[in-house]
Interface confidence: low
C-alpha cells in the first residue's frame, strides 16, 4: 500500500517518499521507483538554509554600500549573507535593508547610550548640576566645575547648556 | 558629457498605465555609483519623488505611489522606465527622470533630463 | 515620511540685495540636505548638496548652512539670473526623497 506520510528529511510525491535535498542543494529531479532525488548544489551567489524541494536557490542578500550598508558575514551555500551599517550609522529595521546616520544629542542633552550598527543614540537631558554646550553623537552631560576647589567663587551659575563661570573671591579689607 | 532623454506619450486615459523611458548616454548606467529615479510636478506645484532604480535591479519606491508603480534599469539599452498603473487626473505633471548621488541613502539628484508633460485625460 | 517646510513661500527683492530662505525639517536628519533652483519650464539644478558644500560650476554668491532641522540658503548679492524658485530636499531618511513646498524668488 503507498505510503500516506514520510519520514523526517523526505516528502511525499506520486505515491512515493523521496529524499529532500540538504541544506545548500537545490532539486534537479523527483525520485522515481528506481532512482534517488537529484540535487545540485546552489551557485556562489546562492543559497538554500533548509533540507528541501525547491528548484531554484535563494539569491543573497546584496548589502548596498549606497544605503550605507557594508557585509557582516558573506553568505555560504547554506547561509544567507548578513548586512550591518557602516561606521556612523545604524540600521532603520530588524531586517537591517538601509541605515540612517545616528543622532546627535543637542546641547542641553547629554548621551546616554552610544550608538551601535542596529541601535541609534540614547539621549538624556543634563541633570542639575551637569551641561553640555556641543550637539555630539558621543559625549555625556560634563558636571560644572567646582569653584571651591579652586579657591574660587561662583560668578555666574551653570545651566544644563553652560558650565559656571569661577571667579577671585572679593578680598575683605580690614 | 552625461544626458538624460525622457520619451513616451503625452496624453494617457484614465484607469490606463502610463510608460515613460528615460535614454542616458555619455556614460555607462552599468555602475554602482549612481540610482536612476524619476520626479514628477503636477502643473504649477512642487517636485515629488517617485522612485530609483539601480543597475543590479534593486528597486526604491516613494510609499505614497508603491502599489501604483515598477521602475526597471537596462543597462544593455542604457535606458530605465517608469510604469505607473491606474493613472487618474491627480498623475498630470511634468515627468523628469534624473540620475541621483549617492550621500549613502538614495541622494540628491543631480543630473536632470529637460522633463516631459504627461495629461491623463479622456 | 520627513516634512520640509520652506519660508517665505515667496518674496521680492531687488538686484544687488542679500537674500536667505530657510527650510525646516520636521526631524533631525543631520546635514543631509540639498537646495536646488528650478526656472520656469527648466529642470531643477542642484546648486547645495550636504547643507552647505557648493555643487561645481555654481557661482560663490549661493551658501548654504544649518544641521538637525535647520538651514538656511543665502545669495549674497542677487543677480538678474538668479530670479527663480528655490527647492530643499532631505535625503536622510528614505525613501521617500522629500522636498520642501518651494519659495519663488521674483524681482521688486
Known amino acids: 500500500e503507498p505510503p500516506t506520510a514520510c519520514r523526517e528529511k523526505q516528502y511525499l510525491i506520486n505515491s512515493q517518499c523521496c529524499s529532500l535535498c540538504q541544506p545548500g542543494q537545490k532539486l534537479v529531479s523527483d525520485c522515481t521507483e528506481f532512482t534517488e532525488t537529484e540535487c545540485l548544489p546552489c551557485s556562489e551567489s546562492e543559497f538554500l538554509d533548509t533540507w528541501n524541494r525547491e528548484t531554484r536557490c535563494h539569491q543573497h542578500k546584496y548589502c548596498d554600500p549606497n544605503l550605507g550598508l557594508q557585509v557582516q558575514q558573506k553568505g555560504t551555500s547554506e547561509t544567507d549573507t548578513i548586512c550591518t551599517c557602516e561606521e556612523g550609522l545604524h540600521c532603520t529595521s530588524e531586517s537591517c535593508e538601509s541605515c540612517v546616520p545616528h543622532r546627535s544629542c543637542l546641547p542641553g542633552f547629554g548621551v546616554k547610550q552610544i550608538a551601535t550598527g542596529v541601535s541609534d543614540t540614547i539621549c538624556e537631558p543634563c541633570p542639575v548640576g551637569f551641561f553640555s554646550n556641543v550637539s555630539s553623537a558621543f559625549e555625556k552631560c560634563r558636571p560644572w566645575t567646582s569653584c571651591e576647589t579652586k579657591d574660587l567663587v561662583v560668578q555666574q551659575a551653570g545651566t544644563n547648556k553652560t558650565d559656571v563661570v569661577c571667579g577671585p573671591q572679593d578680598r575683605q579689607r580690614a | 558629457q552625461l544626458q538624460l532623454q525622457e520619451s513616451g506619450p503625452g496624453l494617457v486615459r484614465p484607469s490606463e498605465t502610463l510608460s515613460l523611458t528615460c535614454s542616458v548616454s555619455?556614460?555607462?548606467?552599468?555602475?554602482?555609483?549612481?540610482?536612476w529615479g524619476w520626479i514628477r510636478q503636477p502643473p504649477g506645484k512642487g517636485l515629488e519623488w517617485i522612485g530609483s532604480g539601480y543597475y543590479n535591479g534593486n528597486t526604491y519606491y516613494n510609499p505614497s505611489l508603491k502599489s501604483r508603480v515598477t521602475i526597471s534599469v537596462d543597462t544593455s539599452k542604457n535606458q530605465f522606465s517608469l510604469k505607473l498603473n491606474s493613472v487618474t487626473a491627480a498623475d498630470t505633471a511634468v515627468y523628469y527622470c534624473?540620475?541621483?548621488?549617492?550621500?549613502?541613502?538614495?541622494?540628491?539628484?543631480?543630473?536632470w533630463g529637460q522633463g516631459t508633460m504627461v495629461t491623463v485625460s479622456s | 515620511d520627513i516634512q520640509m517646510t520652506q519660508s517665505p513661500s515667496s518674496l521680492s527683492a531687488s538686484v544687488g540685495d542679500r537674500v536667505t530662505i530657510t527650510c525646516r525639517a520636521s526631524q533631525s536628519i543631520s546635514s543631509y540636505l540639498n537646495w536646488y533652483q528650478q526656472k520656469p519650464g527648466k529642470a531643477p539644478k542642484l546648486l547645495i548638496y550636504a547643507a552647505s558644500s557648493l555643487q561645481s560650476g555654481v557661482p560663490s554668491r549661493f551658501s548654504g548652512s544649518g544641521s538637525g532641522t535647520d538651514f538656511t540658503l543665502t545669495i549674497s548679492s542677487l543677480q538678474p539670473e538668479d530670479f527663480a524658485t528655490y527647492y530643499c530636499q532631505q535625503s536622510y531618511s528614505t525613501p521617500p526623497i522629500t522636498f520642501g513646498q518651494g519659495t519663488r524668488l521674483e524681482i521688486k
Open positions: 534624473a540620475r541621483q548621488t549617492p550621500p549613502r541613502i538614495i541622494g540628491s539628484p543631480n543630473i
Open positions: 555619455g556614460a555607462s548606467m552599468n555602475t554602482n555609483n549612481y540610482y
